[in-house]
């Protein structure tokens, strides 16, 4: 099938980095500047992606592969192939319709991206709050309140103090 295809379609012989030029008897012409073809047999070359503004060039365009972009400092990539650049916020904030805003009470964000999430509800697991939550950190859950009742402590009691003047046996 490949042989018959190449006999019927001279374009199939055009390698990546070229295109099959209908205006020149279907000969293989190199992709013009700022364009590429990543596969053989193409009738056109694709325009190279341009990394402008908040997008920075991570990899230059070549005749056989598109440019790749990342984001300028203070922004992070979103989407496949860094299709978007989104502003970083501080920990304890989220990006809203009006920019970076502090997390509401009862929520936190420990990253420079993403949304504020509710603190863990320790009581759902039958535990108590060991360390309070902040805008930047989730609460830390500790043992259940029952575990902390008198006589039920799991903490090892300190060794009894020796009387003065007694040396270890």
């Amino acid at each position: 099938f490949e042989r018959t295809r190449s006999l019927q379609d001279p374009c199939s012989n055009c390698p990546a980095g070229t295109f099959c030029d209908n205006n020149r008897n279907q000969i293989c012409s190199p992709c013009p500047p700022n364009s590429f073809s990543s596969a053989g047999g193409q009738r056109t070359c694709d325009i190279c992606r341009q990394c402008k503004g908040v997008f920075r060039t991570r990899k230059e365009c070549s005749s056989t592969s598109n440019a790749e972009c990342d984001c300028t400092p203070g922004f992070h990539c979103l989407g496949a192939g860094c299709s978007m650049c989104e502003q970083d916020c501080k920990q304890g904030q989220e990006l809203t319709k009006k920019g970076c805003k502090d997390c509401c009470f009862g929520t936190f964000n420990d990253q420079k991206r993403g949304i504020c999430r509710p603190w863990t509800n320790c009581s759902l697991d039958g535990k108590s709050v060991l360390v309070n939550g902040t805008k930047e950190r989730d609460v830390v859950c500790g043992p259940s309140p029952a575990d902390l009742s008198p006589g039920a402590s799991s903490v090892t009691p300190p060794a009894p103090a020796r009387e003065p003047g007694h040396s270890p046996q």
Partner: nanobody, 122 residues
Amino acid sequence: EVDLVESGGGLVQPGGSLRLSCAASGFTFRSYAMSWARQVPGKGFEWVAYIYSDGSTYYADSVKGRFTISRDNAKDTVYLHMNSLKFEDMAVYYCATWRSQQVGRWDEYDHWGQGTQVTVSS
């Protein structure tokens, strides 16, 4: 071909004013939300102001009350009126389309101008 050309930058004293313009061509300007962003050397980009196709606006806290973004759909131009300029406003200012319409976010199909320098100096 899409083109955005900024103008109006220059040298101004603290407390002074400037009006930046961004002339657009190659797309249906009135249908697009537009943005101004700035880049301070060594500090990266920050968004400054946005204007929707219907004329509603958003401003960064750092420029609120001092800067005004506006658009003239008949002239395919977006403006940034800058008053009470401060030393910290010194930057290269860029005009860009704003397809995502999410503050602080641009996508790969947005178009950017070449930028215009604003220098604040006494």
